[in-house]
């Protein structure tokens, strides 16, 4: 396949991803099935410079990450280990707290107003932001 | 490689008490919640208790409450579970376990409780 | 406390046969459920969590379904290392509850 060499329209680019800030908000699986409809997924934050240019670009609104543990371990959607990766997390958190009285515990992880991490009830309707990386061999069959 | 290891176990008389540890590597401890669940012999699993990452919240079975305590060190990535007052349907094999959908155990340690 | 019921207690079926086990809870606990096999002896092992999502390293013969209050475990051709006691758990809300379990034996 061609690989995109600039970001779309209405995308962010940085040091080699592109980024689209959503506006409006989703359930952590829509959100996901969202940047995955726009070759993408969900951000996954691989260090403190890249924590700090999604702060920057979200403000103090929760907004959905692209990690996860719903199925057992803490996971990033695009495979990037989560032991030895980078993480924010808010003091006391991750939390699984069950006294939300939704069902189950605290699945999905977001930016909070102060850009670190919780983990919260993956259906609440969060903002969300897609990455996608630069170079990266596009979906589209190469013209013959 | 997730490893729990767990400890602590052995006879002890009705009314005795006992600390089961659970030493945990291979994870990153403070992310995770961890449960405490028991079978009696010939019996089927029983939860007994958990509690979050950062150890703020404890839950508890209700043939428990009172009488065990859940808590945790994260400095040292280890679990435990102090057991007061105890009964002899309390004699199980203990296994922690992790996570909130119990995804990974250890491979239990037998208290029996006994005159 | 939600109460999980499993069927049947027990069967007996060959190698190659397909193999399905019924979880039902006393209330709606959404895909907050689990499975483990137990052999003999051993520690249990997670087999599936969020009622259809098969753990890291357990072969795909196994599947679950459901959601609410019905679940079920299949093997699609069962084998030697998969005669077993199965269990499920939900963990919708504390205290977890199990079922009573499910002995897979040799027929």
């Known amino acids: 396949g061609s690989e995109r060499t600039c970001c779309p329209v209405n995308w962010v680019e940085h040091e080699r991803s592109c980024y689209w800030f959503s506006r409006s908000g989703k359930a952590w699986a829509d959100a996901d099935n969202y940047c995955r409809l726009e070759d993408a997924h969900l951000v996954v934050v691989t260090s403190w410079e890249e924590q700090k240019f999604v702060q920057h670009h979200i403000g103090p609104v929760n907004t959905w990450m692209g990690l996860h543990d719903q199925n057992g371990p803490w996971k990033w959607v695009d495979g990037t280990d989560y032991e030895t990766g980078f993480k924010n997390w808010r003091p006391e958190q991750p939390d699984d707290w069950y006294g939300h009285g939704l069902g189950g515990g605290e699945d999905c992880a977001h930016f909070t107003d102060d850009g670190r991490w919780n983990d919260d009830v993956c259906q609440r309707p969060y903002r969300w932001v897609c990455e996608t990386e630069l170079d990266k061999a596009s979906q589209e069959p190469p013209l013959l | 490689e997730v490893q729990l290891l767990e400890s602590g176990g052995g006879l002890v008389q009705p009314g005795g008490s006992l600390r089961l540890s659970c030493a945990a590597s291979?994870?990153?401890?403070?992310?995770?919640?961890m449960s405490w669940v028991r079978q009696a012999p010939g019996k089927g699993l029983e939860w007994v208790s958990a509690?979050?990452?950062?150890?703020?919240?404890?839950y508890y079975a209700d043939s428990v409450k009172g009488r065990f305590t859940i808590s945790r060190d994260n400095s040292e990535n280890t679990l435990y579970l102090q057991m007061s007052s105890l009964r002899a349907e309390d004699t199980a094999v203990y296994y922690c376990?992790?996570?909130?959908?119990?995804?990974?155990w250890g491979q239990g340690t037998l208290v029996t409780v006994s005159s | 406390d939600i109460q999980m019921t499993q069927s049947p207690s027990s069967l007996s079926a060959s190698v190659g046969d397909r193999v399905t086990i019924t979880c039902r809870a006393s209330?709606?606990?959404?895909?907050?459920l689990a499975w483990f096999q137990q052999k003999p002896g051993k520690a249990p092992k997670s087999l599936i969590s969020?009622?259809?999502s098969l753990q890291s390293g357990v072969p795909s013969k196994f599947s679950g379904s459901g959601s609410g209050t019905d679940f079920t475990l299949t093997i699609s051709s069962l084998q030697p290392e998969d005669f077993a006691t199965y269990y499920c758990?939900?963990?919708?809300?504390?205290?977890?509850?199990f079922g009573p379990g499910t002995k897979v034996d040799i027929k």
């Open positions: 376990a992790k996570g909130g959908s119990l995804f990974y």
């Open positions: 291979g994870f990153t401890f403070s992310s995770y919640a």
């Open positions: 509690i979050s990452g950062s150890g703020g919240y404890t």
């Open positions: 209330q709606g606990i959404s895909n907050y």
């Open positions: 969020a009622a259809s």
């Open positions: 758990q939900q963990y919708n809300s504390y205290p977890f509850t």
